[in-house]
Interface confidence: medium
């Protein structure tokens, strides 16, 4: 037996992080996003739960809703009506899936200082929102959409087809929520509040995933979710628009699907209102390499929505799938005709293009061997966007302004030189027409949120600088973080290395690879974090590395689309390549290398452990995918095509974890899964376990009863990280 090794940070008054610090969230940071209500006014929920109004120009601030009013209904969230007469208060939050939840809503009348009585809202409500003007309310209850012209009015029922697990109006079904819309809602008000667009999802023919929820009862409950796995029947989707001024006169009008899309299975991908009578819908073929953007107009004479062929814009990928993770959405200019959109240029880098008439005639606005990430706002004279251009680091985000009034347009980096060491990864929140904006910096130093003038970019004030966190970290020995790149053949891989305090290159350290590696993801980011792996480096003396291999995002389509139709190959290969390079650096103990990952990362870590290379002593897979046939249609098929003989069934079959069961014989494997995982079903781990048993391979496993994909209940999370820590320390012969 090898002697146990204990890592002791040397001669320092500062203490190492403990696992308890991580589990208690002792070193969590705060961000500050203004809730904009005009060009120069915003709301924010204070530490003590008062809702405070701020006017940037007059410098006034006052409480518009007291914490006692919030507390009277146990409210945890709020929403002010645009006419500022009412506030909805949200309580009884009950999580459903990733974004969806139900809640109870109360309407508070700010004028009268009391709750609106009469025609109170039903409970629980699946989604509720104000119109953009005035105080109309749209809400979804029991899968149907209702409308109130004023909070105290009786509701008008817009849809009648809603049925649990069958037909969803105004809210997405499971697969659309998780893999397409990334929202809990599927309805959108027109800018003037006249029209309400919504989607109807018909899941009647979708196969059901059923799993037990054990609870406390004598018999477990069965959870049933319509969930299309790869190749299965998909939701049937229709988009309707209703005139909310006279909803009973005309009824909802269906918006036509473009001919080239409707000819085979398709998806709705997003809806953008352009003006009060113009709407833009995006559609996607089931084989997700063709996307169509369709601009539709309201024709008063026919009282119908027209989507002429000459207003259809096609986006197609010849090397992979359309878009990044999702197809990008358009940012329309003031003329309500032309728009800006991010898509791949001729070199395969995602860049901003200006489309006036046809996509073929698009004018490229940004270019280079980097990528534009997101368009925040288009005003009359400026376009604000984020990119990873600055200094060539793909894992950074800076905010840029392009002056579109000028010819040629001039570009300015708003954030690149503000707090260069502390801040390299930004997002932003703009007031309606970008008169003011907030910048939120996520690191690599302590996060900080600041308010800026939208004309001059001058900083007006610091909104949140995490002073308390800074003070509490003063006596903590944090590891050193490096972001660098390594080259192998013609490929470049960016990696993040977290090095123990007092790291000494002449010594040997155990190495833990943390992997996600899913298509269009990014792990190597210049952000601040104090989490489990920070603790492992700080206290246990483990070197941690994260590597962005092929298939990851923001480095061009050649790198991104390398994994198209062959998931589980290059993602694993590139992790192995990186490990070999790390060994060559001289400070890694080759006998003590591990890998761990969650979800897609659990899939990659499992395949890496089963690669037969002998590089890894042990590894952990939490909630892994084990076969792409078990996962959601929209996701699996985007990257893998269909699991049919004439398409890609062969690779679906040979990319499973089960197919490599024999290769786990020489590694220590810990397999973990929540039994109530609605996303990556427990089935995935059950099949891995079955294959390992059939192959007579020993392994360790842990299930978490009634836990979902996040294994996030306090007790479960503590148990999970404690268990994984013990496993790793045992693997690395580190004494407890």
């Amino acid at each position: 037996l090898r002697p146990s090794r204990v890592y002791k940070p040397e001669g320092n008054t500062k203490r190492a992080l403990t696992l308890k610090d991580i589990l208690n969230g002792t070193f969590s940071y705060k961000t500050y996003f203004p809730n904009w209500i005009s060009e120069q006014e915003y709301l924010h929920q204070s530490e003590d739960d008062n809702i405070v109004f701020y006017n940037i120009e007059t410098r006034e601030s006052y409480i518009i809703l007291s914490n006692s009013t919030m507390k009277s209904v146990n409210a945890t969230d709020y929403g002010l009506s645009p006419d500022r007469q009412f506030v909805y208060l949200e309580s009884d939050y009950s999580k459903l899936w990733r974004y969806s939840y139900t809640a109870t809503y109360y309407i508070y009348d700010l004028q009268n200082g009391e709750f609106v009585r009469g025609y109170e809202l039903p409970r629980p409500i699946q989604y509720l929102c104000w119109s953009p003007v005035g105080s109309k309310l749209a809400y979804v209850y029991q899968n149907n959409i209702y409308l109130k012209q004023r909070p105290g009015d009786p509701p008008f029922q817009i849809t009648y087809t809603g049925r649990e697990n069958r037909i969803f109006n105004g809210i997405p079904d499971w697969v659309y929520e998780e893999e397409m819309l990334a929202t809990k809602y599927a309805l959108w008000w027109s800018p003037d509040g006249k029209f309400l667009a919504y989607v109807e999802f018909n899941d009647s023919d979708i196969p059901i995933i059923a799993y037990s929820y054990y609870g406390d009862g004598q018999y477990p409950r069965t959870i049933n979710i319509p969930y299309p796995k790869a190749g299965a029947k998909n939701p049937v989707v229709r988009v309707f628009i209703v005139d909310t001024t006279y909803p009973h006169h005309v009824g909802p009008m269906e918006v036509p699907v473009p001919e080239m899309i409707a000819s085979s299975d398709y998806y709705f991908s997003w809806l953008t209102w352009v003006s009060s009578e113009r709407v833009c819908l995006q559609w996607l073929k089931r084989v997700q390499n063709v996307s169509v953007l369709s601009i539709c107009d309201f024709r008063e004479d026919w009282h119908a929505w027209e989507c002429p062929k000459n207003q259809e814009h096609v986006e197609e990928s010849r090397t992979g799938w359309a878009g990044g993770f999702f197809v990008s959405t358009p940012a329309f200019s003031q003329d309500a005709t032309s728009y800006y959109k991010i898509f791949s240029d001729k070199d395969g880098y995602k860049h901003i293009h200006y489309i006036k008439d046809t996509v073929e005639n698009a004018i490229q606005i940004t270019s280079g061997k980097w990528e534009a990430i997101y368009i925040f706002r288009v005003t009359q004279d400026s376009l604000f966007y984020s990119s990873n251009e600055f200094e060539g680091y793909p894992g950074r985000r800076n905010i840029y302004r392009i002056s579109i009034g000028n010819s040629p347009p001039s570009k300015k980096c708003v954030t690149c030189h503000l707090r260069k060491e502390r801040c390299q990864y930004y997002t932003a929140s703009f007031s309606y027409k970008a008169k003011y904006y907030a910048l939120v910096c996520y690191g690599p130093g302590l996060p900080i949120s600041t308010l800026h003038d939208g004309r001059t970019d001058q900083e007006i004030q610091v909104l949140e600088e995490n002073k308390e966190l800074e003070n509490s970290l003063r006596n903590i020995q944090l590891p050193k973080v490096e972001i660098k790149k390594l080259k192998d053949g013609g490929l470049t891989f960016w990696y993040k290395m977290i090095l123990p305090p007092q790291f000494d290159r002449s010594k040997k350290y155990p190495l833990l690879i943390q992997v996600y590696g899913g298509p269009c993801s990014q792990s190597v980011k210049s952000v601040f974090a104090v989490n489990w792996i920070t603790y492992l480096a700080s206290k246990e003396g483990i070197v941690i590395a994260l590597v962005d291999g092929r298939g990851t995002a923001f480095q061009g389509d050649k790198f991104l689309h390398a994994v198209y139709r062959k998931l589980g190959v290059y993602e694993v290969e590139d992790q192995l390549t990186a490990v070999r390079k790390f060994i060559e650096m001289g400070f890694i103990d080759e006998e003590r290398i591990a890998i761990w990952g969650w979800s897609y990362g659990g899939y990659v870590s499992s395949l890496a452990l089963a690669s037969g290379t002998g590089l890894f002593k042990c590894g952990i897979a939490v909630a892994p995918v084990s076969s792409w046939e078990y996962y959601a249609s929209i996701y699996s098929e985007r990257f893998m095509g269909l699991p049919t003989k004439d398409d890609n069934l062969e690779h679906y079959k040979n990319s499973t974890v089960m197919a490599r069961a024999e290769y786990f014989r020489n590694v220590d494997y810990l397999l973990i899964h929540g039994t109530a995982d609605d996303n990556v079903h427990f089935q995935n781990s059950a099949q891995i376990a079955k294959a390992l048993v059939n192959a007579q391979v020993d392994f360790q496993a842990m299930w978490y009863s009634d836990q979902n994909h996040g294994i996030s209940s306090g007790r479960s999370q503590n148990h999970l990280y404690t268990h994984m820590t013990h496993f790793l320390k045992q693997c690395f012969s580190l004494s407890d």
Epitope: R238, F240, V250, G251, P252, M253, E254, V255, P256, V257, P258, E259, A262, C296, W302, A304, W305, E306, C307, P308, K309, E312
Partner: nanobody
């Protein structure tokens, strides 16, 4: 080839009823892009769209002059649209055309040959 064939016209007394039918072939009336309208033309008067329907959603629209008296409907299994005309008046006398359009084209591009409705005592 797209064809719309109307039937059901004729002579009727004021206050009477008629039901016009429009059988479509060559395109599917239950597609979300398809609208069927009834348009009437009378000598010396402007052409008038009296009613239209989007069969996929059941969304309907009527001219003010016929609201409450005329009902447009469709039977997607027969690929046929109908105009039920009640409480007919002399001013409803016209040639009634069934018109079809697909909303990615402007205007009604498919027309039937027309059926005459005469309201007279």
């Amino acid at each position: 080839e797209v064809q719309l064939v109307e039937s059901g016209g004729g002579l009727v007394q004021p206050g009477g009823s008629l039901r016009l039918s429009c059988a479509a072939s060559g395109f599917n009336i239950k597609d979300s892009s398809t609208y069927i309208g009834w348009v009437r033309r009378a000598p010396g008067k402007e052409e008038e769209l009296v009613a239209r329907i989007q069969c996929s959603s059941g969304s309907t629209r009527y001219a003010d002059s016929v609201k409450g008296r005329f009902t447009i409907s469709c039977d997607t299994s027969k690929n046929t649209a109908y105009l039920q005309m009640n409480s007919l008046r002399a001013e409803d006398t016209a040639v009634y055309y069934c018109a079809g359009r697909q909303s990615y084209n402007y205007g009604y591009i498919y027309w039937g040959q027309g059926t005459t409705v005469t309201v007279s005592s």
